[in-house]
Interface confidence: medium
Amino acid sequence: TPEVWVQVRMEATELSSFTIRCGFLGSGSISLVTVSWGGPNGAGGTTLAVLHPERGIRQWAPARQARWETQSSISLILEGSGASSPCANTTFCCKFASFPEGSWEACGSLPPSSDPGLSAPPTPAPILRAD
């Protein structure tokens, strides 16, 4: 069964800036990644970025930079200023479309009492389904 992992980190230099990293553990080829916050995409969550290997990357504020890290993982940096900035307990979700596995999504948030700039290595998060 494929798995998705999500890692959320607060930047040490900008305490209201977040980095979200997501990866897909599966055998298929990734063709689409959607990053959202506030809940799963399609279930109250708001899309922050959509990444497609051929058709490019689209992102919406407060997303600042979305990019592919590897063929099966991405990262997204969020700006931390303004009313739409994330807070420490914000939930971020990543959904991967893979062939032939279909769509898989997982969510994560900043670990409690985490120090800025420090984070544990990514571990597979439980698969969450849109309600």
């Epitope: 689409l32 769509s103 849109a130």
Partner: antibody, heavy 120, light 106 residues
Framework: EVQLVESGGGLVKPGGSLKLSCAAS????????MSWVRQTPAMRLESVAT????????YYPDTVKGRFTVSRDNAKNTLYLQMSSLRSEDTAIYYC?????????????WGQGTSVTVSS | QIVLTQSPAIMSASPGEKVTMTCSAS?????MFWYQQKPGSSPRLLIY???NLASGVPVRFSGSGSGTSYSLTISRLEAEDAATYYC?????????FGAGTKLDLK
Amino acid sequence: EVQLVESGGGLVKPGGSLKLSCAASGFTFSNFAMSWVRQTPAMRLESVATIVNGGINTYYPDTVKGRFTVSRDNAKNTLYLQMSSLRSEDTAIYYCARHDDFLYYAMDYWGQGTSVTVSS
Amino acid sequence: QIVLTQSPAIMSASPGEKVTMTCSASSSVNYMFWYQQKPGSSPRLLIYDTSNLASGVPVRFSGSGSGTSYSLTISRLEAEDAATYYCQQWTSYPLTFGAGTKLDLK
């Protein structure tokens, strides 16, 4: 305008073979995964073959594995389905459909279908 | 393979009514797709990813659900909605379809 046009259907005897074609136009064919889906006389929809955009990986349900072969010619914008050892239960309308990965592989365009009847 | 069971198999409703049909999966699926098929026509994509409307689909259509239970709702039925509706999953290959719900208008 996206168009998918199937051809090659007809009447064939049990154990016989048939090759279906699907001519695609109006989009960059090589960028999309494609499927053959059939609709039985009872109106049930069944996936029979899927091929990724590069054409390297193909997928079949157990009901047709070893009997059906899906292929594509990206230069000709054409999808194929080679069917052999045909059985009466293969009688159906065969549709080709495009998978849009921006829609999480939903089949967003379908052809008009071509009818295959397997009967002695 | 995952079996999708649609209910009811046949339903009848009047224009302006709200109708809901369901799709139950034999094991948990991540997302559901819905297609509409009118007599003599090919299936048409209505909803992808459980709740997202495909291009050109009227907003009276909506989808919801999770796990093994999904539904398609038409908020105010119109004459042109008379058709058969199919659900489809792709959490595990092969992708499978439900047997359909035939919607007739009174």
